[in-house]
Structure formats: C-alpha cells, structure tokens
C-alpha cells in the first residue's frame, strides 16, 4: 500500500560536508517497526546510501561504517549524512517502509537535492 512521504526539495550541505533533513511520513496505522532507506539519484542512476530499521520510540541504528545517522520522533525521521564531497551532489530520496504489524506500507519521497560545495583551498602563506 502507498504512503505519502515529505522531505525538503533543496538543501545545501555545510562546509564540513554534513547535510541534515527531515523525512516525514503520513502513517496510516500504528506501525511498531519502520525501515528507512536513503537512495541517491544522479545521472539517472539510483544507489542505496544507507538504511536502518527501528522500533517506534527507539533510536535508528545504521551500520557502523554508514555515513548516515538519524533520530526519530513520531512520524518524522531526522536524517544526517556526513562526509559529503562536491561529487556527492545529487537527489537524495527518502524511502519509508512500515514493516510491522501488517499491512505493509511503502512511501517514497520526491527527493532532496543536496548541493555539496568543496571548501576553497586556503591560499599559501609565506
């Protein structure tokens, strides 16, 4: 079943390569287990950036080597992606799945365009 997911259209990452945004889903029921996946679309290719499954009321747990961290509050997931470089500029799509209890719901946002600017190199000093 389909579910609405909202996320900002455009975000500029910080000069340290960190971008945070909220992914909000309109939960039709009382889900206890939710899976959040961040997909990156660039030049027509879609790749998975990170994913986490969490129990409502608990923290999101990404893999140890993940570039993502996140917190949840109700139907909102606050996602942070770090270690971004200019080459990582692209459309980051939030996919939310309500895993349990049934029925299963799937929602995919329109994506957040994350622009990443590599810091200017410092001029050499004498």
């Amino acid at each position: 079943k389909a579910m609405h997911v909202a996320q900002p259209a455009v975000v500029l990452a910080s000069s340290r390569g960190i971008a945070s945004f909220v992914c909000e889903y309109a939960s039709p029921g009382k889900a206890t287990e939710v899976r959040v996946t961040v997909l990156r679309q660039a030049d027509s290719q879609v790749t998975e950036v990170c994913a986490a499954t969490y129990m409502m009321g608990n923290e999101l747990t990404f893999l140890d080597d993940s570039i993502c961290t996140g917190t949840s509050s109700g139907n909102q997931v606050n996602l942070t992606i770090q270690g971004l470089r200019a080459m990582d500029t692209g459309l980051y799509i939030c996919k939310v799945e309500l895993m349990y209890p049934p029925p299963y719901y799937l929602g995919i946002g329109n994506g957040t365009q994350i622009y990443v600017i590599d810091p200017e190199p410092c001029p050499d000093s004498d």
């Epitope: 900002p8 259209a9 975000v11 500029l12 660039a42 622009y115």
Partner: antibody, heavy 117, light 108 residues
C-alpha cells in the same frame, strides 16, 4: 501561484550598503533555496550566490565574498541580500530566484540599484 | 570555475526559421545541472530547459535542449515573433554556478 516580489529601486553613494528584499508566496518557503543574480546595464547575468532556506547555509561567488550577506526570515517568507562597500560597478538590476533541484524558477521582477556620487 | 561559452553571439533569423544555439563548457558538466533561460528587454529571465533536455512547465514544444559533457544545444524548431530575445545557458554542476554570456536572437 509561485511568486517572488522584490523591493523597489535604490540609489546609493559609493561606500554605502544596500539591502534588497524578496518576498516569496505560493510554495513552502523553507523547502527551497533562494539565489541572487545581478545584471549590469547592457550586460549578461552574473551569479552572486544562494542561500539554502531550510538550514541557512550559504554559498557566495568568490569575488563578492566578504561584501555580500544573504539571509532569510522564514516567518515572513522573505529573503534578503545585503551588499556592502558599494562601488559604481555594482550598479545593476538584482534578481532573486527560487532554487529547485536543478533550476532557477521563478525569478523576481528585479530591483535596480544605482551607485552614484 | 567552469566557463560557459555561447555561440553565436547574435543570430539573425526570420520568423518560421530554425534556431540552433550552442553552449560549450570549459570542463565537463553533468547534464542534470545544465539549464537554459530566455530574457526579453526589461524583463526577468524565464526558465526554458532544465536538466539539459527537460522543458519547464508551460514552455512550448518548439523549444528543445540536448547535449552532454561539454557541448549543449538549445533548438527552437520554428521561430515565433515572441521568441526573439536573449538566451542564456547556466551550469549548476560545480560551484561557482555560472552563466554563458548569452546569444541574442534577432529578427533578420
């Protein structure tokens, strides 16, 4: 409909500052960015920089760094561009534009800033 | 900085003719981040094409964009009287975002 309405024309003396406003309507202001572009009389378009309204992060053109500041007031859905230490070659029409995933649309109607002693 | 060079500087054509405008980048540009704008005297620019080839809302299908890498083209299949204007390309691929110097399409 989505609209950006800018403040009126200004005449400034060299060395002074100017602050141009851009009021947005018809969309969720915090979801997009606002870019500023200027056009000197009879010349082409020059990108000045932009602000990510969602988090307030900014990216300025190198040549204006230190003289330009872009801010927003989310309570009134208004973006501002302040340019300091004005020179005669800053005389231009200043445009704001909504930044989407890979476009500027729409644009404000433009604000003429004249720098003259 | 990515420099965009537009050619020709001026294009003199008659209504009904085909216009081909070129935009060449000094470095490779992701086609996702190349746009075209139209500007008429005394007016703000208007988005025509984004992502190198996608028409903006309300833009007639006589306008089309193509290209990749360093070479991009805006084509107007049959010029209408209202199409005589200045056209700019712009890249968002790398900061600073830059515009071409513009191509003026004038009535012959």
């Amino acid at each position: 409909q989505v609209q950006l309405v800018q403040s009126g024309a200004e005449v400034k003396k060299p060395g002074a500052s100017v602050k141009v406003s851009c009021k947005a309507s018809g969309y969720t202001f915090t979801s997009y960015g606002i870019s500023w572009v200027r056009q000197a009389p009879g010349q082409g378009l020059e990108w000045m920089g932009w602000i990510s309204v969602y988090n307030g992060n900014t990216n300025y053109a190198q040549k204006l760094q230190g003289r330009v500041t872009m801010t927003t007031d989310t309570s009134t859905s208004t973006a501002y561009m302040e340019l300091r230490s004005l020179r005669s070659d800053d005389t231009a029409v200043y445009y704001c534009a909504r930044v989407g995933a890979n476009w500027f649309d729409p644009w404000g109607q433009g604000s003429l800033v004249t720098v003259s002693s | 900085e990515i420099v965009l060079t537009q050619s020709p500087g001026t294009l003199s054509l008659s209504p009904g003719e085909r216009a081909t405008l070129s935009c060449r980048a000094s470095q490779s540009v992701s086609s996702s981040y190349l746009a075209w704008y139209q500007q008429k005297p005394g007016q703000a620019p208007r988005l025509l094409i984004y992502g190198a080839s996608s028409r903006a809302t309300g833009i007639p299908d006589r306008f089309s964009g193509s290209g990749s890498g360093t070479d991009f083209t805006l084509t107007i299949s049959r010029l209408e009287p209202e199409d005589f204007a200045v056209y700019y390309c712009q890249q968002y691929s790398r900061s600073p975002w830059t515009f071409g110097q513009g191509t003026k399409v004038e009535i012959k």
